[in-house]
């Protein structure tokens, strides 16, 4: 069971300082942006991180949403990352959910975050280059100190 608590507005960056945004095709991508670019591209660069109470505490449970015309929420259904047109629900009556991630602070690096799927233990949000695009994907952690699964989260509230 997950019960919604509070939400905050955040900018999410990879460790190369690229900013996460949602493009016109609703794809989550990373791109180099100045602070003014980041502001100019809002609300596509501003993510709503909603925290949830977890009946089986496994870390800080969150959903990641974005509000353009409508609210879309990040999902990792079948280990594929996509934004689904939905509000983060008030309650989720299950111990796993494709939209719930555990936001983990990397020990020794308070400002570096990982997002582990609640549906797929050991799978994390990651940034991966595919041709000329830097995509947000779900990835099994396969090497120690993998920088691609680490992010910084800057609160905009």
């Amino acid at each position: 069971y997950f019960g919604k608590l509070e939400s905050k507005l955040s900018v999410i960056r990879n460790l190369n300082d690229q900013v996460l945004f949602i493009d016109q095709g609703n794809r989550p991508l990373f791109e180099d942006m100045t602070d003014s670019d980041c502001r100019d591209n809002a609300p596509r660069t501003i993510f709503i991180i909603s925290m949830y109470k977890d009946s089986q505490p496994r870390g800080m449970a969150v959903t990641i949403s974005v509000k353009c015309e409508k609210i879309s929420t990040l999902s990792c259904e079948n280990k594929i990352i996509s934004f689904k047109e939905m509000n983060p629900p008030d309650n989720i009556k299950d111990t796993k959910s494709d939209i719930i991630f555990f936001q983990r602070s990397v020990p020794g690096h308070d400002n570096k975050m990982q997002f582990e799927s609640s549906s797929y233990e050991g799978y994390f949000l990651a940034c991966e280059k595919e041709r000329d695009l830097f995509k947000l994907i779900l990835k099994k952690e396969d090497e120690l100190g993998d920088r691609s699964i680490m992010f910084t989260v800057q609160n905009e509230d």
Partner: antibody, heavy 119, light 110 residues
């Protein structure tokens, strides 16, 4: 980097209660679990329970259920552990520990508080 | 009696490699993750290894962790005098809420 500073040593009589505090500074307090772990003289580590301040949820080890109460004050970034019905075998160093990765991965520790139970 | 079994003591000479074992069962290590803590004399424990084999920032790469079946081990290579300490293993449950520690191993650098 977060720092956890605990209250000073206590000497208590059997049957009484003790309340130990743990103040966090320099990091996020509310979102991450604060655990209490004790260590009797010359012995190993024993997890007592924890609290997640933002939710107020508490979890206690079965052994301490009913005798320990863990609370947190978000406004002062302070966690508290109260242990009642003290007996001599509760003489130990009591540590608070923050868990920012997972509620049971203790990545930052307080300096410890010695509680002596003696008549 | 601890749920996780560690040898009470271990020793080595400077530069040597030492391994500390931690034995459990399917209800703890067999199905869950393992952490290791180092406790220098008179100080609070410090996280050394988390999630079986991950090192927090600042922990030298001389320390490594591994897990196989219902046992885990901590290896320290290039032993140094400052490694003299007590070492504790801990197993934690991803989905439930319980944790157990080993009884600790006192490492002496000869």
């Amino acid at each position: 980097q977060v720092q956890l500073v605990q209250s000073g040593a206590e000497v208590k009589k059997p049957g009484s209660s003790v309340k130990v505090s743990c103040k966090a500074s320099g990091g996020t307090f509310s979102s991450y679990a604060i655990s209490w772990v004790r260590q009797a003289p010359g012995q190993g580590l024993e997890w007592m329970g924890n609290i997640i301040p933002i939710t107020g949820q508490t979890y206690y080890a079965q052994k301490f259920q009913g005798r320990v109460t863990i609370t947190a004050d978000e406004s002062t970034s302070t966690a508290y552990m109260e242990l009642s019905s003290l007996r001599s075998e509760d003489t130990a160093v009591y540590y608070c520990a923050r868990a920012a990765y997972h509620p049971l991965v203790f990545d930052n520790w307080g300096q410890g508080t010695l509680v002596t139970v003696s008549s | 009696q601890s749920v996780l079994t560690q040898p009470p003591s271990a020793s080595g000479t400077p530069g040597q490699r030492v391994t500390i074992s931690c034995s459990g069962s399917s209800s703890n290590i067999g199905n869950h993750y393992v952490n290791w803590y180092q406790q220098l004399p008179g100080t609070a424990p410090k996280l050394l290894i988390y999630r079986n084999n991950h090192r927090p920032s600042g922990v030298p790469d001389r320390f490594s962790g591994s897990k196989s079946g219902t046992s885990a081990s901590l290896a320290i290579s290039g032993l140094q005098s400052e490694d003299e300490a007590d070492y504790y293993c801990q197993s934690w449950d991803y989905s439930g809420f319980s944790t157990v520690f080993g009884g600790g191993t006192k490492l002496t650098v000869l």
